[in-house]
Interface confidence: low
Amino acid sequence: ACDTATCVTHRLAGLLSRSGGVVKNNFVPTNVGSKAF
């Protein structure tokens, strides 16, 4: 199984923002960013 930050981020897509912003549930994002314009 792929457990890199990229894979985890994409697996959670739809549950919370890829960026970790605009959180829709209690998952903690594993990637580095915040949605940046």
């Epitope: 985890v8 981020t9 897509a13 990637n31 580095v32 940046a36």
Partner: antibody, heavy 122, light 107 residues
Framework: EVQLVESGGGLVQPGGSLRLSCAAS????????ISWVRQAPGKGLEWVAE??????????HYAEAVKGRFTISRDNAKNSLYLQMNSLRAEDTAVYYC?????????????WGQGTLVTVSS | EIVLTQSPATLSLSPGERATLSCKAS??????VSWYQQKPGQAPRLLIY???NRYLGIPARFSGSGSGTDFTLTISSLEPEDFAVYYC?????????FGQGTKLEIK
Amino acid sequence: EVQLVESGGGLVQPGGSLRLSCAASGFTFSNYWISWVRQAPGKGLEWVAEIRSESDASATHYAEAVKGRFTISRDNAKNSLYLQMNSLRAEDTAVYYCNGYFDYGLAIQNYWGQGTLVTVSS
Amino acid sequence: EIVLTQSPATLSLSPGERATLSCKASKRVTTYVSWYQQKPGQAPRLLIYGASNRYLGIPARFSGSGSGTDFTLTISSLEPEDFAVYYCSQSYNYPYTFGQGTKLEIK
């Protein structure tokens, strides 16, 4: 070369409509979350609307000031983003920028267009 | 809506000096803050995202810090090309919001 090129701006009367376009090239457009951000003359930045990537069902969100009047959409086959603006008001006068954003986990990509000016005046 | 307040409104410094710009959020935004530079007639340019991550190609003299409600952008030694307007933004929730900007001008 990565490019976002906005078009469709111009002078329109209050109550009128305008459709802005943003043509993307040099990156995988369908993977990107795209926002419109505007800037009134001499003022600061204001987020207008966002459309998420194809894999995120192209979900949309809007600022309260434009909700019900503006519609954001995308055509991934044409690498294009649109902003349909109806019932325009004087306070919608601004330079409109499109912005592409992709987070691939370890870092992000962030691109801006050069902007297109919308003037709402009688 | 989360309000971001930037200070000072204008900062007058000389090349080589250190610049410290502040951004305060009306509610907690964890680390979901970005910083942008904008020069007249140009689109904004992303400098910092996730409060402290430098964007691709951004010089090391730019750094960001903070979490919760208080955030700082620091330019360690000002170059002539750094004089511009700087904005912070938050992406913790909708609507995404920006601060009103800090104008960094040559003293």
